[in-house]
Amino acid sequence: TGADTEAVVCVGTACYTAHSGKLSAAEAQNHCNQNGGNLATVKSKEEAQHVQRVLAQLLRREAALTARMSKFWIGLQREKGKCLDPSLPLKGFSWVGGGEDTPYSNWHKELRNSCISKRCVSLLLDLSQPLLPSRLPKWSEGPCGSPGSPGSNIEGFVCKFSFKGMCRPLALGGPGQVTYTTPFQTTSSSLEAVPFASAANVACGEGDKDETQSHYFLCKEKAPDVFDWGSSGPLCVSPKYGCNFNNGGCHQDCFEGGDGSFLCGCRPGFRLLDDLVTCASRNPCSSSPCRGGATCVLGPHGKNYTCRCPQGYQLDSSQLDCVDVDECQDSPCAQECVNTPGGFRCECWVGYEPGGPGEGACQDVDECALGRSPCAQGCTNTDGSFHCSCEEGYVLAGEDGTQCQDVDECVGPGGPLCDSLCFNTQGSFHCGCLPGWVLAPNGVSCTMGPVSLGPPSGPPDEEDKGEKEGSTVPRAATASPTRGPEGTPKATPTTSRPSLSSDAPITSAPLKMLAPSGSPGVWREPSIHHATAASGPQEPAGGDSSVATQNNDGTDGQK
C-alpha cells in the first residue's frame, strides 16, 4: 500500500503534508525523503498546531479511516540499542532530520522502558472528537512496524519540507485559476504561503466563455530573504470587472480608471512593491524582524532598524535574535555561579552560607555555634566544615564521626594497662589484684601481699587510679571471666603467673567482685590479665558481659 490522498499547509519557512496509507515508519520516512523532506518534527506548540491543521485538512478529504483512534507517524525515533531516558523531555528519542532536542513534548502516557527495539512515535488522533487547537494530538510510542505490518492503528504520516523562504500567493484581478506545484511534488490551488522554487500556472478566463490565457511564474529569491514571482500587476484583469473582482487582486487599495483599467495603491505608511500589487510598511519594524524577545528600534529618518535585547541577553550573529549572556564567565561569585535565562545566581558550597562583604560573597557556617553543634562532646569549627573531638577516655564513633564512645582501656589496642585485674569506667579505668596480691602505689602493678584466698583487692582510690599515658607496665593478654554454674563469673583456670615472681599458683576459686568505691550497687566485671603471655592481646574467651551477680552486701549488681 502506498501513500494516498495528501493535504498541505505552508507556514513560516516550512510546509507540512499529511498522507493516508498503512506504511511502516521506515516506508513513511522514505516517502518524505524522496521529495526532499523528513517525517515531521513537532518542536513547539505552534508547530503542533500546524501539524494538526494539515491532519484536519486530510481528515476532511478522507471518507472513513478504519480506526477510531488513528495514528500518524512523525519524525521522532529512538534507535535500536538506545535506552529510554526518563530524565529528558524527548526521553532519549531524537528527530530524524537531526536538529537539537527541544523542551516541548506531548506524551500520551508513560513510555515503555526498553532499549533493544527501535521505537517510533506517532500522533494519536481520536477521530470521534473534533480537532481543536486546545486539544493537540498526543505522542504515542511503539514498534516502528515493517513492510506489510505497519503497526496497530497506523493510518498515515506527516512530512515536513523546509525552505529558504516563501512567496505570497499570486493575486488574481479577474476570473482564473492558479495551480501551484511545489518542489515536493504537491499541487494545490490554495496555499497561504508558497515555498521558494514553486511553479505557478495561471489560467485566466471563465472556462468556455472566454479564451483562456496561461501564465507561468516561478517563486524566486529576488534579494536576500526577499522572495517573489517576478510578475508585475494583477493577473487575469478584466475591464468587465475592474476593482470589483477580488479587489482587482490588489493587496490594499484598488483605483479604477475610466476605461475599465485599474491600479493598485497603498494606505498611508505603506509603499507599493515591484509586483505593483503588494504593499509593505514604510516602517521597517512593522514586519517584526527582531526575534527572541528583541525589540525593534527605528534608525534615523525611519529608514533602517536595529534590534535591542533586554538586560541579561545579547544579539546573536544574525543581529536579529537574543541569546542569554553567560554572566558566570566573568566569575561574579565567590564560590558557585549558576547561569539563568537573563541573569545568574550565586550559590555557596556546603559548609558556607550567603553573607559577608560584597555581592555573591559566602561566609563560613559555624556548625559549632550554641544550640547547633552536631557533636556529642567537643566541636571545632573549621573553614567550610567542622570536626568533633572527645574528652580523654572517649573516642569518636558513629557513621558520621559525631558521637563519643567510652574507650575500654581494659581491652584497648596494644593490650591492657593493668598488670592483673582491670575495671573499666566511663572515661577511665581502675586496676585491681587477684587474691593474695595488693596494688602497688603506681596503681597498676600488683605486689605479693599476705597469702589469702579472699576477694580481690578493689580499685584504688581516685588519686591512685591508673594513668592513661606513660605506663611502664608490660602489656598483658586478656582473658575475660566466663559464666559460672550459678550465673556468677569465674576466673578461667590457669597456671600462668602475674609478672612479679612468685611460686604461688593462681587458683580457680570463684571470685566475688568488689564494687568500685562510691558506687555500691553497680560494678563492672574485671578482665583478668596474665602478663606472662608472650603473644600479645588475644580474643576474649567468650565471656558474657551482661551477667548480674550477688554482691557481698547482698545487693544485685549489674554491668
Epitope: D85, R112, S114, S117
Partner: antibody, heavy 120, light 108 residues
C-alpha cells in the same frame, strides 16, 4: 511481585545444544526485555544477549558467534535461551534477568540460575 | 567493547571498616549507565546501586557509589559480616553490556 523461575540443571555432551527456559510472573511479560547472563565456575559475569518480547527483536553478544538464539512465548510468559555447539568452556550457571521498572540496564530481577555442565 | 577493570581483585577487611572498590572503564561511560551488584556464593547477583549513586530498593544505607567518566567508586561505610561477597560493576554504552572482573571481599 516479579519472579523469574528457570529450568533445572543440564548435563550435555560437547557439540550438543542446550535450551534453558525462564518463566516470568508478577508483571506483564511483554513490558520488559529479558536478558541472559552466564557465569563460568570461579569466573565473573558475562552478558549473552537480550530479547524484547513485544517485538521479538534481539541483541546478542558477538562473543557467541551466532551460537545463541533467544526466543519468547508470550502465551506462557516464558523466555528461552538456546546455545548450540557446546564445548567445555560453556560449563556455567546461566541466569535470566531483567530491569523491571528501573532504567539504563540496571538488572533488578534475576532467576535462580540454571547449571549447565558440558562433559564428554 | 568497553572493558571494566575493578580494583582490588580481592580484599580483606575487619567488621566496621570502610571499604572502597574502584571500577575503571576503558572509555567514558554515562553515569546513568553504571551499576553495582553483590553476589554471594551459590546465589544470583543482587543489584545494590544503580546509575552510579542510587540505592536499589531495600539496600542498607552503608552502601554508596560515586564517580563519572571512566572512574567509579563503590563504598561500604562500615563493613558488616553479611557483606562477605563478590562485588561487580556493570555498564552499558552500546552492546555488549559488560561487567567488571569482580572484587572478592573477605572479613579478617
Amino acid at each position: 511481585q516479579v519472579q523469574l523461575v528457570q529450568s533445572g540443571a543440564e548435563v550435555k555432551k560437547p557439540g550438543a545444544s542446550v535450551k534453558v527456559s525462564c518463566k516470568a510472573s508478577g508483571y506483564t511479560f511483554t513490558d520488559y526485555e529479558m536478558h541472559w547472563v552466564r557465569q563460568a565456575p570461579g569466573q565473573g559475569l558475562e552478558w549473552m544477549g537480550g530479547i524484547d518480547p513485544e517485538t521479538g527483536d534481539t541483541a546478542y553478544n558477538q562473543n557467541f558467534k551466532g551460537r545463541v538464539t533467544m526466543t519468547t512465548d508470550t502465551s506462557t510468559s516464558t523466555a528461552y535461551m538456546e546455545l548450540r555447539s557446546l564445548t567445555s568452556d560453556d560449563t556455567a550457571v546461566y541466569y535470566c534477568t531483567n530491569y523491571g521498572n528501573l532504567y539504563y540496564y540496571a538488572m533488578d530481577y534475576w532467576g535462580q540460575g540454571t547449571s549447565v555442565t558440558v562433559s564428554s | 567493547e568497553i572493558v571494566l577493570t575493578q580494583s582490588p581483585s580481592s580484599l580483606s577487611a575487619s567488621v566496621g571498616d570502610r571499604v572502597t572498590i574502584t571500577c575503571r572503564a576503558s572509555s567514558s561511560v554515562s553515569s546513568s549507565y553504571l551499576h553495582w551488584y553483590q553476589q554471594k556464593p551459590g546465589k544470583a547477583p543482587k543489584l545494590l546501586i544503580y546509575s552510579t549513586s542510587n540505592l536499589a530498593f531495600g539496600v542498607p544505607s552503608r552502601f554508596s557509589g560515586s564517580g563519572s567518566g571512566t572512574s567509579y567508586t563503590f563504598t561500604i561505610s562500615s563493613l558488616q559480616p553479611e557483606d562477605i561477597a563478590t562485588y561487580y560493576c556493570q555498564q552499558y554504552s552500546g552492546y555488549p553490556l559488560t561487567f567488571g572482573s569482580g572484587t572478592k571481599l573477605e572479613i579478617k
